[in-house]
């Protein structure tokens, strides 16, 4: 019933909304001063119909 | 039902940007998904060159990472191509794509009908 | 980057028959249970469409005469019966790993 830890993005913070990541919890990383991110700022711990939930998209990269 | 469409200058001089446009009807961009470019080149091969994420975040393809631009605006639901210093190897067909989620292990569900871009002189 | 061989290159099938395109990863597309493996049709002057999306579940409004399996580095599609409406170029695509990458297309006649 709650997806796994996304984890820490090198040179990023994140804003968690649930510290036990159930379904539709959201994370947001933000890329430190002068860092890039590539890749998707929020994620979402979606339930699937098969399966356990999991992340709508992969944790991003923070880059120089 | 989602639909997208491209629209592009046709011709693009060699060193120029080339920019397209997609315009997205019956779903808003902010709401969800990844909002992907994707060109295929004469000969057909395929090349995915990034996308926009409904959140406003980019990712790009290392390969063009120097070159390229996604941007959107959201009172116009349209997302923007924009690749810089381009060269004949640049002419193809360009697609916008509509993504499904990570967590269904997607790929591109909804497809514009594509814009010829030729780099000529 | 992930680089996608598909085979054959070209493809000859009666009607009726099977038809089977492989495409192998030059390394695994797996992550957290799924395979990361897409198949898309294409026609002349039209769009890829999406067919198969997580290696093996059919795209809704896709004939169910179209199969995928496989995982790790070695996957399949299957068309049978082929109809004549068919003939296309295949593509595999993954999107398990940045960049994003599509396979060389493999043309059924």
């Known amino acids: 019933t709650s997806c796994h830890d996304p984890g820490d993005v090198e040179h990023s913070r994140r804003l968690i909304s649930s510290p036990k990541f159930p379904v539709g919890a959201t994370v947001q990383y933000i890329c430190d001063q002068g860092f890039v991110l590539m890749g998707s700022s929020i994620l979402t711990c979606h339930d699937r119909q098969a399966g356990s939930p999991k992340w709508s998209d992969r944790a991003p990269k923070c880059l120089l | 039902d989602v639909q997208l469409q491209e629209s592009g200058p046709g011709l693009v001089k060699p060193s120029q940007s080339l920019s397209v446009t997609c315009t997205v009807t019956?779903?808003?961009?902010?709401?969800?998904?990844?909002w992907n470019w994707i060109r295929q080149f004469p000969g057909n091969k395929l090349e995915w060159m990034g996308y926009i994420h409904y959140s406003g975040s980019t990712n790009y393809n290392p390969s063009l990472r120097s070159r390229i631009s996604i941007t959107r605006d959201t009172s116009k639901n349209q997302f923007f191509l924009q690749l810089n210093s381009v060269t004949t190897e640049d002419t193809a067909t360009y697609y916008c794509?509509?993504?499904?989620?990570?967590?269904?292990?997607?790929?591109?569900?909804?497809w514009g009908q594509g814009t010829l871009v030729t780099v000529s002189a | 980057d992930i680089v996608l061989t598909q085979s054959p290159a070209s493809l000859a099938v009666s009607l009726g028959q099977r038809a089977a395109i492989s495409c192998k990863p030059s390394?695994?597309?797996?992550?957290?249970?799924?395979?990361?493996m897409n198949w898309y049709q294409q026609k002349p002057g039209q769009p890829p469409k999406l067919l198969i999306y997580a290696a093996s579940n059919l795209e809704s409004g896709i004939p169910a005469r179209f199969s995928g399996s496989g995982s790790g580095t070695d996957f399949t599609l299957n068309i049978h019966p082929v109809e004549e409406e068919d003939a296309a170029t295949y593509y595999c695509h993954q999107i398990n790993d940045d960049p994003w990458t599509f396979g060389g297309g493999t043309k059924l006649k």
């Open positions: 390394q695994s597309v797996d992550y957290d249970g799924d395979s990361y």
């Open positions: 019956g779903y808003s961009i902010t709401s969800s998904y990844t």
């Open positions: 794509a509509r993504s499904r989620y990570y967590y269904d292990a997607y790929g591109f569900a909804y």
